[in-house]
């Protein structure tokens, strides 16, 4: 499911509950995706020794994974709500191609990988509703994404395993930073 359970105000388990505010819904959505990433990381780490590998730099050269930097205004010092929100949305849009890459990388967690991808799309929609300055959000070029995907899929097995591990780790870090920043707003 792209949305965590219990989101609906008609939820029978909690009829007394008020509907979630947009902030609560976004917070819950991020946590739902992070739970999914946790499950995927578990499979990745059990399947290979990538999680302990020190050769990450080799694979990292091929990737341009979104990262939070000081200038993005998402950290406590120099915090800027609008700049940060733009960074979070832009970063999530940039992660989409990497989440697409993950789709055929899991055996027992295939549904989980799909759920992470779909939930991220929903999260982007939630955040776009919250953002005032949508013009500042740059959408990745589909042609560039398509060639990147082809390039990643053409890597040897070891690099593909390492890429999977790096994507999950970076996406987890990005979402954790986003969660903290959104709570700070």
């Amino acid at each position: 499911a792209p949305v965590p359970p219990g989101e609906d105000s008609k939820d029978v388990a909690a009829p007394h509950r008020q509907p979630l505010t947009s902030s609560e819904r976004i917070d819950k959505q991020i946590r739902y995706i992070l739970d999914g990433i946790s499950a995927l990381r578990k499979e990745t780490c059990n399947k290979s020794n990538m999680c302990e590998s020190s050769k990450e730099a080799l694979a990292e050269n091929n990737l341009n994974l979104p990262k939070m930097a000081e200038k993005d205004g998402c950290f406590q010092s120099g915090f800027n709500e609008e700049t940060c929100l733009v960074k979070i949305i832009t970063g999530l849009l940039e992660f989409e191609v990497y989440l697409e890459y993950l789709q055929n990388r899991f055996e027992s967690s295939e549904e989980q990988a799909r759920a992470v991808q779909m939930s991220t799309k929903v999260l982007i929609q939630f955040l776009q509703k919250k953002a005032k300055n949508l013009d500042a959000i740059t959408t990745p070029d589909p042609t560039t994404n398509a060639s990147l995907l082809t390039k990643l899929q053409a890597q040897n097995q070891w690099l593909q395993d390492m890429t999977t591990h790096l994507i999950l780790r970076s996406f987890k870090e990005f979402l954790q930073s986003s969660l903290r920043a959104l709570r700070q707003m």
Epitope: S23, D27, Q76, F79, R180, M185
Partner: antibody, heavy 120, light 107 residues
């Protein structure tokens, strides 16, 4: 030195209202999320409400949702808790606390508390 | 909502002893956990955040550990100033619930 000073506590009748304040000093108030936490006599701590630095993010405990409103005035370095429809179970010491994002929202500074008694 | 179960509710120990307080969450809270100390008539003080990181100025005899749903606070070689109440708090899901507390008394 970071300082948080709560005020506004006192005796209130059931069904009544009260507004608590928390004056902050010694840090850039507008850069930090803030919490209200309460403690009933001889009981444990209960998280009440949270507000982000720019007031866009506001969260409440289910026990106070719809009755309490957290707000802040950044230029005046002040945090507020407007309490309405007060009940006897709201009797407690109310603390304001600073939320440190770098410390995963943990409360790194607390005020000395202000006591609220709901009784007829 | 995720519930926090803290144990024991009370604990008697002597100066020099080592004590451990545990908190169990009803779901994975991904290390989003803090520990606080509160002395009688005083405000709580932050001891540990992110489950394992000691807050500024906290003596090294305190240590936090755990992951997933199980967390603990260990105090090595108890000092007289360590007696009081201890609380864990989750920061993963909302509400940011506290554990029920542990009252640490001098034996």
């Amino acid at each position: 030195d970071v300082q948080l000073v709560e005020s506004g506590g006192g005796l209130v009748q059931p069904g009544g209202s009260r507004k608590l304040s928390c004056a902050a000093s010694g840090f850039t108030f507008s850069s930090f999320g803030m919490h209200w936490v309460r403690q009933a006599p001889e009981k444990g701590l209960e998280w009440v409400a949270y507000i982000g630095s720019g007031s866009s993010t506001v969260y409440y405990a289910d026990t106070v949702k719809g009755r309490f409103t957290i707000s802040r005035d950044n230029p005046k370095n002040t945090l507020f808790l407007q309490m309405t429809s007060l009940r006897s179970e709201d009797t407690a010491m109310y603390y304001c606390a600073r939320s440190e994002t770098a410390r995963a929202e943990a409360m790194d500074y607390w005020g000395q508390g202000t006591s609220v008694t709901v009784s007829s | 909502d995720i519930q926090m179960t803290q144990s024991p509710a009370s604990l008697s120990a002597s100066v020099g002893e080592t004590v451990t307080i545990t908190c169990r969450a009803s779901g994975n809270i991904h290390n989003y956990l803090a520990w606080y100390q509160q002395k009688q008539g005083k405000s709580p003080q932050l001891l540990v955040y992110n489950a394992k990181t000691l807050a500024d100025g906290v003596p090294s005899r305190f240590s936090g550990s755990g992951s997933g749903t199980q967390y603990s606070l260990k105090i090595n070689s108890l000092q007289p100033e360590d007696f009081g109440s201890y609380y864990c708090q989750l920061f993963w899901s909302i509400p940011w619930t506290f554990g029920g507390g542990t009252k640490l008394e001098n034996k």
